[in-house]
């Protein structure tokens, strides 16, 4: 295979039919077959090549590794463990590689891994110890700062007999390894709820993306500990109203920007506090775009233009007067 070029342009390694047995480890500047490498940019791209496993002969200089659009299926323990270790690898993108299983310790021996993208993989089996690497109650801290897990929900028929939300949260919380995580993206995962303990145990979060899920309520979610939170994306969920406790917590976060577009807000008497808050707060971005979805008579009304007289609740009829 070709050595890498000294310029920042990429050199590629064509597939070869030599013996698959490597009598000695690869030279440090080799480029794996089916990949493109730039030593100057410290980058290796093995993209859309239908790879079924992580190349064994990754160059030691790699800082940015793209393994997108492949057919990896399973990421085993130590999938990136090498001798010498890939000590410089900081950004790893595995999106769209048909991963359905990530095993415990898959990312061990990557001491500099700051950014990991597993998006667009149908993760039916994400080990609780995928990111912590250990089943200890308190693991060594992960170096991860940014974890991108958008659209990792598998098709309904491929899910395990357990809560998908619970599986993901277990991996996020195991061993308290992700205490340093600053960006977490969980968009497009059909989340119905957010387990109440997840945010409390990720105190360093700056950016949290929960957009395009199916969240109905934030009643049991506490944002109080997230004092560093700068952006909270809740667009395209199923939120009906934000209650006082949530409003107060969000208002108390010093740097926060909240995104609430495209939720089916229910503009009845329970919405009064939220409307009052919206009129006063600066934390909601694009608040003038928020509109009612229900009841029918309120559809498309702008929340900021409502007053208390608009927000009424139909009286609850006695059971004898209710119709089916």
């Amino acid at each position: 295979s070709s050595p890498t070029s000294s310029a920042s342009s990429f050199s590629s390694s064509a597939p070869f039919l030599a013996s698959a047995v490597s009598a000695q480890p690869p030279l440090p500047d080799q480029c794996p077959a089916l990949c493109e490498c730039s030593e100057a940019a410290r980058t290796v791209k093995c993209v859309n090549r239908n790879l079924t496993e992580v190349p064994t002969d990754l160059p030691a200089y790699v800082r940015n590794l793209f393994l997108t659009g492949n057919q990896l299926a399973v990421l085993p323990a130590g999938a990136f463990a090498r001798r010498p270790p890939l000590a410089e690898l900081a950004a790893l993108n595995l999106s769209g590689s048909r991963l359905d299983e990530v095993r415990a310790g898959a990312f061990e021996h990557l001491p500099s891994l700051r950014q990991l993208d597993l998006s667009h993989n149908p993760l039916a089996d994400l080990s609780p110890f995928a990111f912590s690497g250990s089943n200890a109650s308190v693991s060594a801290p992960s170096p991860l700062v940014e974890l991108i897990l958008n659209h990792i929900v598998p098709p309904e028929d491929e899910r395990q007999n357990r809560s998908f939300e619970g599986m993901v949260v277990a991996a996020l919380l195991a061993g308290r390894a992700l205490q340093g995580l600053r960006r977490l993206e969980l968009a497009s995962n059909h989340f119905l709820y957010l387990p109440r303990d997840v945010l409390a145990q990720l105190p360093s979060l700056r950016h949290l993306d929960l957009s395009n899920n199916s969240l109905v309520s934030l009643t049991y979610v506490s944002f109080r500990n997230l004092t560093h939170l700068e952006s909270l994306h809740l667009e395209d969920n199923a939120l009906k109203v934000l209650h006082n406790g949530t409003l107060a917590e969000l208002q108390g976060l010093p740097h926060i920007r909240v995104f609430l577009d495209n939720n089916p807000w229910v503009c009845d008497c329970h919405m009064a506090d939220m409307v009052t808050w919206l009129k006063e707060t600066e934390v909601v971005q694009g608040k003038d775009r928020l509109t009612c979805a229900y009841p029918e008579k309120m559809r498309n009304r702008v929340l900021l233009e409502l007053n208390s007289a608009d927000l009424d609740c139909d009286p609850i009829l006695p059971p004898s007067l209710q119709t089916s």
Epitope: V21, P25, A77, G78, A81, R83, P85, G105, H109, P111
Partner: antibody, heavy 121, light 111 residues
Framework: EVQLLESGGGLVQPGGSLRLSCAAS????????MTWVRQAPGKGLEWVSE????????NYTPSLKDRFTISRDNAKNTLYLQMNSLRAEDTAVYYC??????????????WGQGTTVTVSS | DIVLTQSPASLAVSLGQRATISCRPS??????????IHWYQQKPGQPPKLLIK???NLESGVPARFSGSGSGTDFTLTISPVEAEDTATYYC?????????FGGGTKLEIK
């Protein structure tokens, strides 16, 4: 219980050949890298060779790679070391060893009892 | 190849006292999170037994009187307090790169 049992050692003349075997039991042999380590009489440990689960990656200590060949048969749960052109300095106890995880070995916590190879005329 | 220099070659320590063994790799074998040095104990006629992995992590079932420390190019195995059954030869091993290499060994005798 993990068990590794070496065999095939013995007395051989210089220039001769031997094939060592290591029969594995008590674990899924096909998942693990396997390694040979040797120890000359009264001397220290020397890493010889390793092989990954599907035999696609093989490494040797540089001074031995031209004469020694590691292989495995996952169907038989057996690891092999073919030794050719043997020399007096190859006289040693040969151990097979296994790491505790199923990726590149960093250390070894399962060892066989060893088989003795003596190269002498 | 990475050369591991172990010292002393032999050591006699009184029962209950502390034994300290040094291992110095010819180049750094540490990242920010791991040191790729491991320690073994070998008694006559037996295979080696793993004591410590990654410089300081005690292997399951190994008594707590064994401990490891160090990083970069300077590592230490400490046994305290020494017991009679600790009479053995101790080896360090690096797994930073291929070929894996062992130190020359330190023979510990209990007085």
């Amino acid at each position: 219980e993990v068990q590794l049992l070496e065999s095939g050692g013995g007395l051989v003349q210089p220039g001769g050949s031997l094939r060592l075997s290591c029969a594995a039991s008590g674990f899924d042999f096909s998942r693990y890298w396997m390694t040979w380590v040797r120890q000359a009489p009264g001397k220290g440990l020397e890493w010889v060779s390793e092989i990954n689960p599907d035999s696609r990656t093989i490494n040797y200590t540089p001074s031995l790679k031209d004469r020694f060949t590691i292989s495995r048969d996952n169907a038989k749960n057996t690891l092999y070391l073919q030794m050719n052109s043997l020399r007096a300095e190859d006289t040693a106890v040969y151990y097979c060893a296994r790491p505790d995880h199923d990726y590149n070995p960093y250390y070894f916590n399962y060892w066989g009892q060893g088989t003795t190879v003596t190269v002498s005329s | 190849d990475i050369v591991l220099t172990q010292s002393p070659a032999s050591l006699a320590v009184s029962l209950g006292q502390r034994a300290t063994i040094s291992c110095r790799p010819s180049q750094s074998v540490s990242t920010s999170s791991n040191s790729y040095i491991h320690w073994y104990q070998q008694k006559p006629g037996q295979p080696p037994k793993l004591l410590i992995k990654y410089a300081s992590n005690l292997e399951s079932g190994v008594p707590a009187r064994f401990s490891g420390s160090g990083s970069g190019t300077d590592f230490t195995l400490t046994i305290s307090p020494v017991e009679a059954e600790d009479t053995a030869t101790y080896y360090c091993q690096q797994s930073w790169e291929i070929p894996l290499t062992f130190g020359g060994g330190t023979k510990l005798e209990i007085k």
